[in-house]
C-alpha cells in the first residue's frame, strides 16, 4: 500500500578525528586494538544506519524499529561532509541526481500510519567490512534523539557529539502528496469524474472545480436563473425541467393540453381568462361584448356560453333587430331630415350641412383632416382649430417642437430632439420614454430560496443561511476556513459544520485535549503524562513498554548477591566510599560501623538506594499548556501546537512571510493568523473580492454579473472586451472618452456622452 508520509534524514557531516571505533580500536587495526601512535588516516569506511521508533524518555537502543529503519551506502572515511538539507543542498543534490547519482546521505523511511508526532531516532555510524556481518565490534558511534516533529517542508537540524564522533544531520517529516494534516491521515486526491470534480487545497479539503458544488463536488451548478424547485441539471450550465414545467429557466408551468383562453399556476391547469369558460376556456361567456350582434339600437343580453338575446326597440324585430316595422313613426331623422321607410327600416334625407343615417353628423371643416402630425381637429362655426400633440406646434401642427427644452429626461446621459419627438439616452438600469422606470433586474436568479432585491442596473440576492455567492448558488463551505484543530476532520452541514476529532481530542473544534491519563493506562505504579493527543508513561526501572507492563530483567549481569555493608573496601574516589551495586548506577556506597552503609547520590537522584529520580517537573516549568516530562537532573517540555522553545514560551510568528493579500493586515495568533481585510475584500488571506461588481466595473453601459471570485460584463451593441471598453467601431478604438464616458462612433469621427459632472470633447 502507498505510504501516508515519509520521515527523511539528511546526514551532512561526520567527524571521527581519530578514525577509531566506539570500542577504542582502530577501524582497520589487526585484532581491533588501538595502536600507540593513534589510528591511520581514513582507515574507516563509514556508513550510517537509522532506526525510528515510538517516543522513549529513556532511549533503549535495542528492540524493534517500530516506525521503520534505513541505511546509507559507505559515505566516506573517518570524516566527511555532504551538502546540507535546504535550498542550497537541494540544488547540489539535484545536480547529482541529474548526473544519475543517488543522494547518498539521505535516508527516507516511509510510514503507513497516522504520524504520532513524537518519536525516538537512533543513528549509528558503522565501519564497513566485507568479511563480516555488522556486529558491535564495527560500531563507530551511536547517538539518539527523542522529541516531537510536525510534517512540514522545513528541515530541523540536529548535532551530536558522541564518545568518538561528531554528527550533523537534518530531519523532517513530509506527508505523501495526497495526505494532509498534522498526522498525515487526511486523504485528498484531485479528480474529475462522477466521484467528484475537485482539486485539493493546502489543508486537504476538496475545492470544487468551476461548475460543481457540494461536499463531494458531485452536484452540478445549473444555468443561472434555473428554478431548482422545478428543474435541475446533472452537468453544469444546464436547466432540465421537471415534468409539467417548461421555459429556459423551468419557471413556466405547462397548461392543460388544448387550453385556449386560459393559463396555469401549477402544471396541467387551465384557468380561464375573463369572459371565457369551459374545460379548455374555449366558451365565450361575453358574446355580446366581443361580437355586438344586435343592430338598430337593440340591447344585447348574454345567455348560455356562446349564446345571446337581442331586446329590440319599438319598430324592430328579428334575432338581431334587423327587421324594421313602421320605422319612421319615431321620427328618427334629426336636424330637419325627412324620413322614408324602406324594407330594411328607414332612410333619412338630410339638409345641407348634415349627414349620417339619422342626420346627426355635422359636416365640418375638419372632414378634410387639416391637422397634421396626429393633431386633433375641433370644428368651429367659422372654421376649425388644431389641438397639437406635445411634439408639434403651428396652425395645422406642421412645425416641430423642441421637447428637450422642457428637460423631460430623468435618468439619462442626454436628450436628443427628433422630428416629431425626442429621445432620452437612458443610463443603464433605467427605461421608459423619459428614463423614469427602474428596470426590474430580478428574474429568478436567486437560487436556494434566496430573496431578490432590485437595484438600479442590478440586483442583490439575500441568501438563506448556509448559502452565498451572487445568486446564492454557493453552498457556504463552513469547512473552508479549516475550523477543526488537532487534525480533526471537518464535515460541512446545511446549518454549520461538525468536527470529527481524532483520538485524544474533543470539543466542537477538537480544541480540548482529552486527558488520556484519566483513568491512567500506566501499569506498575508508573506516572502518566498527558500529551497532545497522546500520553506517556514514566516507567520504574524494572518495567518498560508503552504502558510499563513489560517486566525488565533486574540483574542483567546475572544473579544478585547478598551485600554485607558495601561489600568492598573504600575505593580511590572518596575516603570510605565504594562503587558497590547496592546503591545502583546512580550512587556511591559508604560503609558504616556494624556492617551498615549509606548511599551518596549522583546529582538528580535521591532515596536510600539512590534509585529515585528527583522530579524536576514539580515547579511546573513548561508554559502555555506544555507537558513536562521528568528526566535525570533535567526536564523536557512537550509543546502544544503553536508554541516552541525549551519552556514552550515562544510563539512563532505565523505572519512571516506575510500571508495577507490586497493590503490586508496580519495578526499573529497561536499556530494561526488572522487577516483583517481592506473594504471590498474577503477570505482567509483577503484573496477574494467581496463584491466583484460596482458601478464602474463595466464601461459603456455594460451590465456586470458577479460570479463569486470573478465578474462578467454583458456588453451593449458596438462594444466588446472583458469590461466593454473595446469599441467594435474603429473610430472609438481605443476608447477616447475618459472618466466613464460612452463613445459613439460614426465613420471616422466620434462623440462622447459624458457622465454627470464631466464635459468636454473627451469628458476631461
Amino acid at each position: 500500500a502507498r505510504p501516508m508520509g515519509y520521515f527523511e534524514l539528511q546526514l551532512s557531516a561526520l567527524r571521527n578525528v581519530n578514525g577509531e571505533l566506539l570500542s577504542g580500536a582502530c577501524c582497520d587495526g589487526d585484532g581491533r586494538t588501538t595502536r600507540a601512535g593513534g589510528c591511520g588516516h581514513d582507515e574507516c569506511d563509514t556508513y550510517v544506519r537509522v532506526c525510528l521508533k515510538e517516543y522513549q524518555a529513556k532511549v533503549t537502543p535495542t528492540g524493534p524499529c517500530s516506525y521503520g529503519h534505513g541505511a546509507t551506502p559507505v559515505l566516506g572515511g573517518n570524516s566527511f561532509y555532504l551538502p546540507p538539507a535546504g535550498a542550497a543542498g537541494d540544488r547540489a543534490r539535484a545536480r547529482a541526481r541529474a548526473g544519475g547519482d543517488q543522494d547518498p546521505g539521505l535516508v527516507v523511511i516511509p510510514f503507513q500510519f497516522a504520524w504520532p508526532r513524537s518519536f525516538t531516532l537512533i543513528v549509528e555510524a558503522w565501519d564497513w567490512d566485507n568479511d563480516t556481518t555488522p556486529n558491535e565490534e564495527l560500531l563507530i558511534e551511536r547517538v539518539s534523539h527523542a522529541g516531537m516533529i510536525n510534517p512540514e517542508d522545513r528541515w530541523k537540524s540536529l548535532h551530536f557529539s558522541g564518545h568518538v564522533a561528531h554528527l550533523e544531520l537534518q530531519i523532517r517529516v513530509r506527508c505523501d502528496e495526497n495526505y494532509y494534516s498534522a498526522t498525515c491521515n487526511k486523504f485528498c486526491r484531485p479528480r474529475n469524474d462522477f466521484f467528484g470534480h475537485y482539486t485539493c487545497d493546502q489543508y486537504g479539503n476538496k475545492a470544487c472545480m468551476d461548475g460543481w458544488m457540494g461536499k463531494e463536488c458531485k452536484e452540478a451548478v445549473c444555468k443561472q436563473g434555473c428554478n431548482l424547485l422545478h428543474g435541475g441539471c446533472t452537468v453544469p450550465g444546464e436547466c432540465r425541467c421537471s415534468y409539467g414545467w417548461q421555459g429556459r429557466f423551468c419557471d413556466e408551468c405547462v397548461p392543460y393540453p388544448g387550453c385556449v383562453h386560459g393559463s396555469c399556476v401549477e402544471p396541467w391547469q387551465c384557468n380561464c381568462e375573463t369572459n371565457w369558460g369551459g374545460l379548455l376556456c374555449d366558451k365565450d361567456l361575453n358574446y355580446c361584448g366581443s361580437h355586438h350582434p344586435c343592430t338598430n339600437g337593440g340591447t344585447c343580453i348574454n345567455a348560455e356560453p356562446d349564446q345571446y338575446r337581442c331586446t329590440c326597440p319599438d319598430g324592430y324585430s328579428g334575432r338581431n333587430c334587423e327587421k324594421a316595422e313602421h320605422a319612421c313613426t319615431s321620427n328618427p331623422c334629426a336636424n330637419g331630415g325627412s324620413c322614408h321607410e324602406v324594407p330594411s327600416g328607414f332612410e333619412c334625407h338630410c339638409p345641407s350641412g348634415w349627414s349620417g343615417p339619422t342626420c346627426a353628423l355635422d359636416i365640418d371643416e375638419c372632414a378634410s383632416n387639416p391637422c397634421a402630425a396626429g393633431g386633433t381637429c375641433v370644428d368651429q362655426v367659422d372654421g376649425f382649430e388644431c389641438i397639437c400633440p406635445e411634439q408639434w406646434v403651428g396652425a395645422t401642427c406642421q412645425l416641430d417642437a423642441n421637447e428637450c427644452e422642457g428637460k423631460p429626461c430623468l435618468n439619462a446621459f442626454s436628450c436628443k430632439n427628433l422630428i416629431g419627438g425626442y429621445y432620452c439616452d437612458c443610463i443603464p438600469g433605467w427605461k421608459g420614454i423619459n428614463c423614469h422606470i427602474n428596470v426590474n433586474d430580478c428574474r429568478g436568479q436567486c437560487q436556494h430560496g434566496g430573496t431578490c432585491k432590485d437595484l438600479v442596473n442590478g440586483y442583490q440576492c439575500v441568501c438563506p443561511r448556509g448559502f452565498g455567492g451572487r445568486h446564492c448558488e454557493l453552498e457556504r463551505d463552513e469547512c473552508a476556513s479549516s475550523p477543526c484543530h488537532s487534525g480533526g476532520l471537518c464535515e460541512d452541514l446545511a446549518d454549520g459544520f461538525h468536527c470529527h476529532c481524532p483520538q485524544g481530542f474533543s470539543g466542537p473544534l477538537c480544541e480540548v485535549d482529552v486527558d488520556l491519563c484519566e483513568p491512567s493506562p500506566c501499569r506498575n505504579g508508573a506516572r502518566c503524562y498527558n500529551l497532545e493527543g497522546d500520553y506517556y508513561c514514566a516507567c520504574p526501572d524494572d518495567f518498560g513498554g508503552k504502558n510499563c507492563s513489560v517486566p525488565r530483567e533486574p540483574c542483567p549481569g546475572g544473579a544478585c548477591r547478598v551485600i554485607d555493608g558495601c561489600g568492598s573496601d573504600a575505593g580511590p574516589g572518596m575516603p570510605g566510599t565504594a562503587a558497590s551495586g547496592v546503591c545502583g548506577p546512580h550512587g556511591r556506597c559508604v560503609s558504616q560501623p556494624g556492617g551498615n552503609f549509606s548511599c551518596i547520590c549522583d546529582s538528580g537522584f535521591t532515596g536510600t538506594y539512590c534509585h529515585e529520580n528527583i522530579d524536576d517537573c514539580l515547579g511546573q516549568p513548561c508554559r502555555n499548556g506544555g507537558t513536562c516530562i521528568d528526566e535525570v537532573d533535567a526536564f523536557r517540555c512537550f509543546c502544544p501546537s503553536g508554541w516552541e522553545g525549551e519552556l514552550c514560551d515562544t510563539n512563532p510568528n505565523d505572519c512571516l512571510p506575510d500571508p495577507c493579500h490586497s493590503r490586508g493586515r496580519c495578526y499573529d495568533l497561536v499556530n494561526d493568523f488572522y487577516c483583517a481585510c481592506d473594504d471590498g475584500w474577503k477570505g482567509k488571506t483577503c484573496h477574494s473580492r467581496e463584491f466583484q461588481c460596482d458601478a464602474y466595473t463595466c464601461s459603456n453601459g455594460g451590465t456586470c454579473y458577479d460570479s463569486g471570485d470573478t465578474f462578467r460584463c454583458a456588453c451593449p451593441p458596438g462594444w466588446k472586451g472583458s469590461t466593454c471598453a473595446v469599441a467594435k467601431n474603429s473610430s472609438c478604438l481605443p476608447n477616447p472618452c475618459v472618466n466613464g464616458g460612452t463613445c459613439v462612433g460614426s465613420g471616422a469621427s466620434f462623440s462622447c456622452i459624458c457622465r454627470d459632472g464631466w464635459e468636454g470633447r473627451t469628458c476631461t
Partner: antibody, heavy 123, light 107 residues
Framework: EVQLVESGGGLVQPGGSLRLSCAAS????????IHWVRQAPGKGLEWVGG????????DYANSVKGRFTISADTSKNTAYLQMNSLRAEDTAVYYC????????????????WGQGTLVTVSS | DIQMTQSPSSLSASVGDRVTITCRAS??????VAWYQQKPGKAPKLLIY???FLYSGVPSRFSGSGSGTDFTLTISSLQPEDFATYYC?????????FGQGTKVEIK
C-alpha cells in the same frame, strides 16, 4: 503483473444474499478505483457501483441502491460486493475492474478486468 | 442518468474495411468517454480513453474522436481479430453508463 480475481459467485434464491470478493495484486491498491460491472446472459455491460479505496467513497447504480454495498480492505488489497435482497434480474456475470483517475484526464477508463464470476438468482 | 446511444447495433464488414461506430450522449459529458472491445466469454478490454487517447498496447488502427455529446470509434482497416462487440462508456457525471453495444461481424 496486475491481476484482479473475483470469487464468491453461485446460485442463490430470490431475496437471498451473496458476497463477492475481488482480490487485487501487482499495483498500489489505494491509487485506483475499483468498479463492479455486470453482464446479464446475452446482454450488454451494466455498471453496478464503484469504490475509491483510499478514502472509502462509494457510488451505486440506481438499480442496486439500498440493496448492494461495496467496501474495501486495504490491508488485504481486496474489494467486496455485498448483495442483499437479490432478484432474478440480478442474474449476471459480475466483473471487477480497476480505474485510474487523474484530474487532468476525464474518462480514464477501466484498464484491467477480472475474469468474472457468475451469480444466478433462481428459485 | 445519462443515456449513451450506440449506432449501429450491428454491422457486417470485410477484412480491410474502414469501420465507424458512433455513440451519442443524452447530455454533455466533456471528453469522459472510453471504448471497450469484448469477445464472447471474455472480459472487456480498454481501447480508447478520454475520447481520443489510445490505450497502451492497442493497435494504431483504432482511433477515437469527439467531445460533448457525439463520439466516434474508427477502425481504419479491419483485421480478423477485430470481430467482436464494442461498447462506449461515459464516466463524467452521475452513474457511469455504457452504450448498448455494436456487434461487428464478418460479411
Amino acid at each position: 503483473e496486475v491481476q484482479l480475481v473475483e470469487s464468491g459467485g453461485g446460485l442463490v434464491q430470490p431475496g437471498g444474499s451473496l458476497r463477492l470478493s475481488c482480490a487485487a495484486s501487482g499495483f498500489t491498491f489505494t491509487s485506483y478505483d475499483i468498479h463492479w460491472v455486470r453482464q446479464a446472459p446475452g446482454k450488454g455491460l451494466e455498471w453496478v457501483g464503484g469504490i475509491s479505496p483510499a478514502d472509502g467513497d462509494t457510488d451505486y447504480a440506481n438499480s442496486v441502491k439500498g440493496r448492494f454495498t461495496i467496501s474495501a480492505d486495504t490491508s488485504k488489497n481486496t474489494a467486496y460486493l455485498q448483495m442483499n435482497s437479490l432478484r432474478a434480474e440480478d442474474t449476471a456475470v459480475y466483473y471487477c475492474a480497476r480505474n485510474d483517475y487523474d484530474v487532468r484526464t476525464v474518462g480514464s477508463g477501466m484498464d484491467y478486468w477480472g475474469q468474472g464470476t457468475l451469480v444466478t438468482v433462481s428459485s | 442518468d445519462i443515456q449513451m446511444t450506440q449506432s449501429p447495433s450491428s454491422l457486417s464488414a470485410s477484412v480491410g474495411d474502414r469501420v465507424t461506430i458512433t455513440c451519442r450522449a443524452s447530455q454533455d459529458v466533456s471528453t469522459a468517454v472510453a471504448w471497450y472491445q469484448q469477445k464472447p466469454g471474455k472480459a472487456p478490454k480498454l481501447l480508447i480513453y478520454s475520447a481520443s487517447f489510445l490505450y497502451s498496447g492497442v493497435p494504431s488502427r483504432f482511433s477515437g474522436s469527439g467531445s460533448g455529446t457525439d463520439f466516434t470509434l474508427t477502425i481504419s482497416s479491419l483485421q480478423p481479430e477485430d470481430f467482436a462487440t464494442y461498447y462506449c462508456q461515459q464516466s463524467y457525471t452521475s452513474a457511469p453508463t455504457f452504450g448498448q453495444g455494436t456487434k461487428v461481424e464478418i460479411k
